[in-house]
Interface confidence: low
């Protein structure tokens, strides 16, 4: 009979009866016996616990007791394992991935690690980073394409581009958050002054001395004024877009009423204040008659000029 | 004190679109924080729609990914919901959320805005 | 999806007493879960989160505990404040909430 099994040298585990190593080695092919792994080691379905087997090739599995590493000895900063097991065996390879802006250390936005038999192959990396940013009517004085959290990275204005009040170089910060800004730089003659004033209006911010090309500045109309056009007006190629304007309102005082012997109809305001487009209503005054038809009673109110009725 | 404050209308009219905005105050919207919507339809629990970094970058509920589009406007410190094609299963309070990040993927909500109502109806 | 169940659906319990609110979930999510109460016509309050740190501002009669599947919610002594909607919330793998239990008065 055929003795193909010795008896069984286990590393990080054992038999659960070594006192069976007279009596039954070498094993015949066919027997199975029960072991155990230490700790931080696992049997090949996981357990900590399971059957040695003897084949005509040997002892199976041929490794009993494997490897194991832990989730909670990973440290990652600004990145995440998405597996939710907390146990891996060896040779496992686990991926992680880095939060929006950071990067491996090769520039991927995901790595992976591996359990080996000391533990897991290194820690993950996942480093702040900023790209090459896009840059217009100017240049980067570095080759770079990525940069490091807190990384300056300078640049320069092509010839007649300018970034504000004469400056022709700038530098931005990668940050937390990205790049402290864009870097762009503008047609000297693109940018604009203040934006006009308008009568009876004005602006709803403080003005500056010079806009950047596509900057907007909000208009608003004072009291009783009706503003006409947009309330934005927009910087490009160096010019304002037509700014709104604030049409009069009518104002009908009692003065021109008496002028005209005639008072408003359903009201006894001594001044009233009208928009362009609406309709006031008028009567004779007690003892005065209407010279001309009762429609002539209803004046419209245009860009602040209405034209009375009259009562003799 | 970061505060949350949703806005948008309260009533949508079934295969309409759900529009609602999420402002932001007392703190930057480009925090590294990731900025959430959930809703509660009446007289249940919660449930998670999506979430959105100040860079764009998106997360959706599997479940609701086809109709919703999370975007973010940085000018105006504040992050805004479309859910399309909205039938009666949509009603409910609909609230944002800011996640309070730590060292993990994602966190549990720490703030949240007070929520508002939004009925599907014709 | 990872389901999350909590039980039970109601929970009645003199003031005074202690709660104990549990929540399973459908596979391990670690430590990654949170607690929340949510008053009638108010939006959930965070309570706890990593299974076991409470919030800022959070009573200490508050604790959670649990790895994994299993979760507790311990409300040592309680306060008529206390009465409210529990929900657990999993951010392992997305973020999904359990269907919550009601804590009230008994």
């Known amino acids: 009979e055929v003795k193909p099994c010795d008896f069984p040298e286990i590393q990080h585990g054992g038999l659960y009866y070594k006192s069976l190593r007279r009596l039954y080695f070498p094993a015949a092919a066919g027997q199975s016996y029960s072991y155990y792994c230490d700790q931080n080691f696992v049997t090949p379905s996981g357990s900590y616990w399971d059957y040695i087997h003897c084949t005509q090739d040997g002892w199976s599995p041929t490794v009993p007791c494997l490897r194991t590493c832990s989730k909670s000895d990973i440290e990652i900063e600004n990145g995440f394992i998405s597996e939710s097991s907390s146990i891996y065996i060896l040779n496992k390879e686990i991926q992680y991935k880095c939060k929006p802006g950071y990067a491996t250390a090769d520039g991927n936005s995901s790595g992976s690690i591996t359990c080996l038999q000391n533990g897991w192959s290194a820690q993950p990396i996942c480093i702040k980073f900023c790209d090459m940013p896009v840059f217009e009517n100017s240049r980067a004085k570095s080759n770079g394409m990525r940069f490091k959290l807190h990384d300056t990275l300078d640049y320069e204005c092509y010839d007649g581009y300018e970034i504000s009040y004469g400056n022709t170089t700038g530098s931005i910060v990668c940050g937390e958050d990205g790049w402290s800004h864009f870097p762009t730089c503008y047609n000297s003659s693109e940018k604009c002054g203040p934006p006009p004033p308008i009568s009876n209006g004005d602006t709803t911010s403080f003005l500056l001395k010079v806009y950047v090309p596509q900057s907007r500045v909000e208009y608003q109309c004072q009291s009783y004024y009706e503003l006409q056009g947009s309330n934005y007006v927009t910087c490009s190629n160096g010019e304002w877009s037509e700014p709104p304007r604030c049409i009069h309102p009518c104002i009908i005082t009692e003065e021109n009423m008496n002028k005209n012997n005639i008072q408003l109809k359903g009201k006894s305001d001594i001044k009233y204040y009208a928009k362009t487009g609406d309709t006031i209503e008028f009567m004779c005054k007690l003892g005065y008659n209407a010279n001309t038809s009762v429609l002539s009673f209803q004046a419209v109110c245009r860009e602040g000029i209405v034209e009375y009725p009259r009562c003799e | 004190q970061v505060q949350l404050q949703e806005s948008g209308p309260g009533l949508v009219k079934p295969s309409g679109t759900l529009s609602l905005t999420c402002a932001v105050s007392?703190?930057?919207?480009?925090?590294?924080?990731?900025w959430s919507w959930v809703r509660q339809p009446p007289g249940k629990g919660l449930e998670w729609i999506g979430e959105?970094?100040?860079?764009?970058?998106?997360n959706y509920n599997p479940s609701l990914k086809s109709r919703v589009t999370i975007s973010v406007d940085k000018s105006k410190n504040q992050f805004s919901l479309k859910l399309r094609s909205v039938t009666a299963a949509d009603t409910a309070v609909y609230y944002c959320?800011?996640?309070?990040?730590?060292?993990?993927?994602?966190?549990?909500?720490?703030?949240w805005g007070q929520g508002t109502m939004v009925t599907v109806s014709s | 999806e990872i389901v999350m169940t909590q039980s039970p659906a109601t929970l009645s319990v003199s003031p005074g007493e202690r709660a104990t609110l549990s929540c399973r979930a459908s596979?391990?999510?670690?430590?990654?879960l949170a607690w929340y109460q949510q008053k009638p016509g108010q939006a959930p309050r965070l309570l706890i989160y990593?299974?076991?740190t409470r919030a800022t501002g959070i009573p200490v009669r508050f604790s959670g505990s649990g790895s994994g599947t299993q979760f507790t919610l311990t409300i040592s002594s309680l306060q008529s404040e206390d009465f409210a909607v529990y929900y657990c919330?999993?951010?392992?793998?997305?973020?999904?909430f359990g269907q919550g239990t009601k804590l009230e008065i008994k």
């Open positions: 596979q391990s999510v670690s430590s990654n």
């Open positions: 919330q999993q951010y392992d793998n997305w973020r999904t």
């Open positions: 959320a800011r996640d309070q990040l730590s060292s993990g993927p994602t966190d549990a909500f720490d703030i």
């Open positions: 007392g703190g930057s919207i480009s925090s590294s924080n990731w």
């Open positions: 959105i970094y100040h860079s764009g970058s998106t």
């Open positions: 990593g299974a076991s």
